[in-house]
């Protein structure tokens, strides 16, 4: 059960996650005109990833496309790459883990098949929430920097008379999204790696037993098990991952001291 | 068709308050902004107060404190409350909406004329 | 405040001569977002209300003839007439409109030579 909600609780947790992703990555309001020290201003500008915009105070809006991809700066296109990036992966991941997600049942889907769908999904979020975290962090670093270097040299003065200042850009709504919906995103595929873990199927010992005519003892075989002696640190049975399912004819039994009734 | 019509003007003692208004037709306040912008006898334009279409206001810096810029959108009508009235405030008021864009003031009333004497 | 300066104070300018109105703002009124300019011209005639000519330092308002013309960028603008006509005799002014208070040039008075 606690499995089972771990699972769906990383799943909800990366969707709204991606969902800030994706907004974050629509978002306009990347960088923000800084107002501190500045005169009042009646026109505010603020940029996004794909477009800038600048609002007057009577309400109009106008936004401009960056309709040019080389003119860009490098920066920019890498930030926009490592946003894309995290979407795709993480909308992968969250088709993935609808399959994976342990109340929804699909034909005669095996636990162990589901266990390793989840912990790829959960792998996918969580690299996708690290693309949504650097990328945002990206463009944070490159607005500080942008920021001191205008500051240094905010004021150009013509003759001491005219002042020309030079717009200087601050943290945009759309960061704040960014860090938390890829914080929420890496939060969801931890959460659904560890629900991996609880994921394959608790069986019974003893559930295959074949019984072979081998001369003066019945040997049963475990299926799927390795017998254990009950003493130590290693109290229950350890389920093996074997990459599959098999028939009872094609795993060999060894006789051993616990392979006799 | 667009249209500003400016009253409340009259003489006023100093240190008095008087409300002007300006009943605007052919938009609505929801949608524009409007100035009050004043004009002293053979001087020069002085811009006084705005309101938005939102309903954020701005003013002139020396006129802050005093002056008052309102609206009431129902009744298509802005207002410029204005306190502590000088002998310097005699002036012609206009009202004047904003044309929206570029931030230009495109339609004028004819003015309202206040004096403030003893 | 921004302080907008118009030269010269008055001009005589004969009929059918270009008029040329200055006026420099204290600071730049160009958006680097939009690369507009935030300056309107204004006319005034006695009596009467201004009147809008010229919004974003050069777009004409609708109604307004095409002999006025309204160039220039970030502190220095120019506002011609460039035949002037009978009709134009009136005081010009110039308005920032970037920066709170809006404020206005101190006028330019045009005459008929």
């Known amino acids: 059960m606690a499995v089972t909600a771990c699972q769906g609780l990383g799943f909800v947790v990366s969707l709204i996650g991606i969902a800030g992703i994706i907004a974050a990555t629509c978002m306009d309001q990347w960088s923000t005109q800084d107002l501190y020290n500045n005169p009042v201003t009646a026109v505010f500008n603020y940029q996004g990833l794909w477009r800038s915009c600048v609002r007057e105070s009577s309400g109009f809006t106008e936004c401009r496309g960056y309709f040019t991809l080389l003119g860009l700066p490098a920066m920019l296109q890498a930030v926009r790459a490592l946003m894309i990036v995290g979407i795709v992966l993480g909308a992968i991941g969250l088709l993935v883990s609808i399959f994976a997600l342990k109340c929804i049942r699909i034909g005669s889907m095996e636990d162990s098949a589901k266990a390793n769908m989840t912990l790829t999904s959960g792998i996918m979020f969580i690299v996708s929430g690290l693309c949504a975290i650097a990328g945002v962090s990206v463009f944070a670093n490159m607005l500080v920097t942008n920021f001191w270097m205008s500051t240094a040299n905010m004021y150009t003065g013509m003759g001491g008379m005219v002042q020309t200042v030079q717009t200087r850009y601050t943290f945009g709504a759309a960061l704040f999204v960014g860090w938390v919906a890829g914080g929420l995103t890496l939060i969801g595929g931890v959460m659904m790696c560890i629900a991996c873990r609880g994921l394959a199927p608790e069986e019974t010992n003893y559930k295959a037993v074949s019984y072979h005519a081998s001369g003066h003892s019945v040997a049963y075989k475990p299926g799927g098990f390795k017998a254990s002696t009950g003493f130590g640190s290693n109290t229950k049975n350890k389920k093996i991952y074997d990459g599959g399912a098999r028939t009872e004819d094609e795993v060999q039994s060894y006789p051993s001291k616990h392979d006799y009734v | 068709q667009v249209q500003l019509v400016e009253s409340g003007g009259g003489v006023v003692q100093p240190g008095r308050s008087l409300r002007l208004s300006c009943a605007a037709s052919g938009f609505t306040l929801t949608s524009y902004g409007v100035y009050w912008v004043r004009q002293a006898p053979g001087k020069g334009l002085e811009w006084v107060a705005v309101?938005?279409?939102?309903?954020?206001?701005n003013y002139a810096d020396a006129l802050k404190g005093r002056f008052t810029i309102s609206k009431d959108n129902s009744k298509s009508t802005l207002y410029l409350q204005m306190n502590s009235l000088r002998a310097e405030d005699t002036a012609v008021y206009y009202c004047?909406?904003?044309?929206?864009?570029?931030?230009?003031?495109?339609?004028w009333g004819q003015g309202t004329l206040v004096t403030v004497s003893s | 405040d921004i302080v907008m300066t118009q030269s010269p104070d008055s001009l005589a300018v004969s009929l059918g001569e270009r008029a040329t109105i200055n006026c420099k703002s204290s600071q730049s009124l160009l958006n680097s977002g939009n690369q507009k300019n935030y300056l309107a011209w204004y006319q005034q005639k006695p009596g009467q209300p201004p009147k809008l000519l010229i919004y974003?330092?050069?777009t004409r308002e609708s109604g307004v003839p095409d002999r006025f013309t309204g160039s220039g960028s970030g502190t220095d603008f120019t506002l011609t007439i460039s035949s002037l006509q009978a009709e134009d005799v009136a005081v010009y002014y110039c308005q920032n409109d970037h920066f709170f208070p809006f404020t206005f040039g101190q006028g330019t008075k045009v005459e008929i030579k």
């Open positions: 309101v938005w279409a939102g309903g954020n206001t």
């Open positions: 974003g330092a050069s």
């Open positions: 004047a909406r904003d044309r929206g864009r570029l931030l230009a003031m495109d339609y």
